[in-house]
């Protein structure tokens, strides 16, 4: 989604004194070099003992508007035989990121910085066994 929208509810954009565009450079620069992204493994989500799927989270009023989020496939972990191990739990690893959210009904549009928790993958942990008293 675009970051600087115009709205029919906003002042006349034809007016010479109206600030039509606030240009913000939102390009993401890769300081580690161009080759780093090609090394990102995309098959861990299937090979992991706590496999996950990725979902395309869309929000037109957010920048970035598209964020890929992980969701654990199972509550339990997968053992070497490919069966679910009921002594081990699959848990989501979450990362806090900063996003820009469009303020509703503001003219010109303004954005606020918000924190967002995003699932980035899943890991396997031992189940908590509660002893009977």
């Amino acid at each position: 989604a675009a970051i600087i929208p115009q709205s029919s509810a906003c002042p006349n954009t034809e007016a010479k004194d109206f600030l039509q565009n606030v240009k913000v450079n939102l390009k993401v620069f890769n300081s580690l070099g161009a080759k780093v992204s090609s090394r990102r493994p995309s098959d861990y989500l299937n090979r992991s003992t706590s496999p996950w799927t990725l979902h395309r989270n869309e929000d037109p009023d957010r920048y970035p508007s598209v964020i890929w989020e992980a969701q654990c496939r199972h509550q339990r972990c997968v053992n070497a035989e490919g069966k679910l191990d009921h002594h081990m739990n699959s848990v989501l690893i979450q990362q806090e990121i900063l996003v820009l959210k469009r303020e509703p009904e503001s003219c010109p549009f303004t954005f606020r910085v918000e924190k967002m928790l995003v699932g980035v993958g899943c890991t396997c942990v031992a189940s908590i066994v509660r002893q009977a008293a």
């Epitope: 675009a2 080759k35 037109p60």
Partner: antibody
Framework: EVQLVQSGAEVKKPGASVKVSCKAS????????FHWVRQAPGQGLEWIGV????????AYNQNFRDRATLTADKSTSTAYMELSSLRSEDTAVYYC????????????WGQGTLVTVSS | NIVMTQSPATLSVSPGERATLSCKAS??????VGWFQQKPGQSPRLLIY???NRYTGVPARFSGSGSGTDFTLTISSLQPEDFAVYFC?????????FGQGTKLEIK
């Protein structure tokens, strides 16, 4: 120079499957989403789905969820779209297109692959 | 799903004249609209993104406007190579949808 080169035309029988490829060059393959769009003869464009080669994530148009499978091979910078249980209505030109996820638009398109479904 | 409706289906204009193509969304799509040109046997070519931004290398005679539900593509002075089919498309929310196209023909 960014290029998306698709595989050649296919003729299939109803009920069969087809797998169309789209080879990317001129940029880092894993940085952008690949979307697949089809165009039936003389018709408009219909969005099939998306794959992100960087993380393997996929999303589909509900109309294709049960029959379309999108995959990507990072070693060859190639995206694939497989459509199963073909019927005559699937006769169309299938396009791959690169989507700039942050900027939010389709910029480069493949040349298209004509898939004809006929008994 | 968001429906994109283009009008007219066919537009006959003489070279050198101005052409105005319309696209209406079934619900607000902010400015998340693109315009594509397609010639017979070719793939779509991006002209305008975010409703009014001209894509790299697109001639200045092409301009886009609108927000919310109503969008317009204007070609100020038609050149012979501009006669083609034009599609609008929304990427506000998936499934991304396209208009049925406007065929721009020589009068």
């Amino acid at each position: 120079e960014v290029q998306l080169v698709q595989s050649g035309a296919e003729v299939k029988k109803p009920g069969a499957s087809v797998k169309v490829s789209c080879k990317a060059s001129g940029y880092t393959f894993t940085d952008y989403e690949f979307h697949w769009v089809r165009q039936a003869p003389g018709q408009g464009l219909e969005w099939i789905g998306v794959i992100h080669p960087g993380n393997g994530g996929t999303a589909y148009n509900q109309n294709f969820r049960d029959r379309a499978t999108l995959t990507a091979d990072k070693s060859t910078s190639t995206a694939y779209m497989e459509l199963s249980s073909l019927r005559s209505e699937d006769t169309a030109v299938y396009y791959c297109t690169r989507f700039l996820t942050y900027e939010g638009y389709f910029d480069y398109w493949g040349q298209g692959t004509l898939v004809t479904v006929s008994s | 799903n968001i429906v994109m409706t283009q009008s007219p289906a066919t537009l006959s204009v003489s070279p050198g004249e101005r052409a105005t193509l319309s696209c209406k969304a079934s619900q607000s799509v902010s400015i998340d609209v693109g315009w594509f040109q397609q010639k017979p046997g070719q793939s779509p070519r991006l002209l305008i993104y975010h409703a009014s931004n001209r894509y790299t290398g697109v001639p200045a005679r092409f301009s886009g406007s609108g927000s919310g539900t109503d969008f317009t593509l204007t070609i100020s002075s038609l050149q012979p190579e501009d006669f083609a089919v034009y599609f609008c498309q929304q990427d506000y929310s998936s499934p991304y949808t396209f208009g049925q196209g406007t065929k721009l023909e020589i009068k």
